[in-house]
């Protein structure tokens, strides 16, 4: 069985341009970097920088490359077999439950709390109560109540779109 391709952004149907390489499907599937032709007899290569496929497949079109949003940096470009990898800029993060945009990290913790985790591309700073050690999940405090800290340095991708 082939692995499922889960990327949702799909490129429109492609006609095979002369420069697109063709090969025959194997067991009804085309290799990563290709899609199947409309008659099911050929594998047509994806277009570098435009679209891609990551698994053996019988899709009739390749998947459209993700374009990094403003506020994101491109960690690696789109190839015919891998989608673009985008990451939130330094000082911003993307949460799993709100993946559509990068949000600014808080600059510090509320009074009575201490920072135990830096801002990363995938998480805000982490604060805990000094006494109890319990995590804080409230809103950003007023400026005068914060203990400032410098944002963390991005270390790894926050969103693998491929």
């Amino acid at each position: 069985e082939s692995a499922l391709i889960t990327q949702q952004d799909l490129a429109p149907q492609q006609r095979a341009a002369p420069q697109q390489k063709r090969s025959s499907p194997s067991e009804g599937l085309c290799p990563p970097g290709h899609h199947i032709s409309e008659d099911g007899r050929d594998c047509i290569s994806c277009k570098y920088g435009q679209d891609y496929s990551t698994h053996w497949n019988d899709l009739l079109f390749c998947l459209r490359c993700t374009r990094c949003d403003s506020g994101e940096v491109e960690l690696s470009p789109c190839t015919t077999t891998r989608n673009t990898v985008c990451q939130c800029e330094e000082g911003t993060f993307r949460e799993e439950d709100s993946p559509e945009m990068c949000r600014k990290c808080r600059t510090g913790c509320p009074r009575g709390m201490v920072k135990v985790g830096d801002c990363t591309p995938w998480s805000d700073i982490e604060c805990v109560h000094k006494e109890s050690g319990t995590k804080h999940s409230g809103e950003v405090p007023a400026v005068e109540e914060t203990v400032t800290s410098s944002p963390g340095t991005p270390a790894s991708p926050c969103s693998l779109s491929g």
Epitope: S2, L4, I5, T6, Q8, D9, L10, A11, P12, Q13, P25, E27, G28, L29, I36, S37, E38, D39, G40, H55, N57, D58, L59, L60, F61
Partner: antibody, heavy 113, light 110 residues
Framework: SVEESGGRLVTPGTPLTLTCTVS????????MIWVRQAPGEGLEYIGF?????SAYYASWAKGRFTISKTSTTVDLKMTSPTTEDTATYFC???????????WGPGTLVTVSS | DIVMTQTPASVSEPVGGTVTIKCQAS??????LSWYQQKPGQPPKRLIY???TLASGVPSRFKGSGSGTDFTLTIRDLESADAATYYC????????????FGGGTEVVVK
């Protein structure tokens, strides 16, 4: 044309093979699909077999059905039928971009003790 | 597996009326969608493929549209012969994603 055969009354757990016979086109050039329809229900995709004899199944059908083919027929083996498998089973010709364009009349399978 | 959500489950319109059936795919399938008509005791009949291309012999009263994840089948100038159940089915990536049909829409012509 496409025509299914082999449907009958079977007891639960008794393997049953349905056969799809084609004429007027070459099975070696087309994929073939199996679909079923329980009484009063909608169409349910089971799986298909490619022109080069590779079979793929709906996730719910894996292990419950086996699709194979010869030069003129496509078989659907029901490995261990249950009462929920009572349905009319359709075989059809599948083309990648144009869908399922040629259907058989269906064959009725009744699974009952 | 891909999931096809079809609405409404049933619709009733008079002769000469118009019916609109919608089909939504759980992921984009470009324009690779087919529509089928099925009458009781008969196998399905392909009406439309590639979202909008009419199959041979199908009257132009039937119109398919859409791309990506959202598709529509419109039947105008309804005739009594149009009373049937209609199904959508994706055509791209049948081995990759499966080819589940939509749940069907029963069209009753009054």
């Amino acid at each position: 044309s496409v025509e299914e055969s082999g449907g009958r009354l079977v007891t639960p757990g008794t393997p049953l093979t349905l056969t799809c016979t084609v004429s007027g086109f070459s099975i070696s050039r087309y994929a073939m699909i199996w679909v079923r329809q329980a009484p009063g229900e909608g169409l349910e995709y089971i799986g298909f077999i490619t022109s080069d004899s590779s079979a793929y199944y709906a996730s719910w059908a894996k292990g419950r059905f086996t699709i194979s083919k010869t030069s003129t027929t496509v078989d659907l083996k029901m490995t261990s039928p249950t009462t929920e498998d009572t349905a009319t089973y359709f075989c059809a010709r599948y083309t990648y971009s144009d869908g399922t364009d040629l259907w058989g009349p269906g064959t009725l399978v009744t699974v009952s003790s | 597996d891909i999931v096809m959500t079809q609405t409404p489950a049933s619709v009733s319109e008079p002769v000469g009326g118009t019916v609109t059936i919608k089909c939504q795919a759980s992921q984009s399938i470009s324009t690779y969608l087919s529509w089928y008509q099925q009458k009781p005791g008969q196998p399905p009949k392909r009406l439309i493929y590639k979202a909008s291309t009419l199959a041979s012999g199908v009257p132009s009263r039937f119109k398919g549209s859409g791309s990506g994840t959202d598709f529509t089948l419109t039947i105008r100038d309804l005739e009594s012969a149009d009373a049937a159940t209609y199904y959508c089915q994706p055509n791209s990536g049948i081995a990759t994603y499966g080819a589940a049909f939509g749940g069907g829409t029963e069209v009753v012509v009054k």
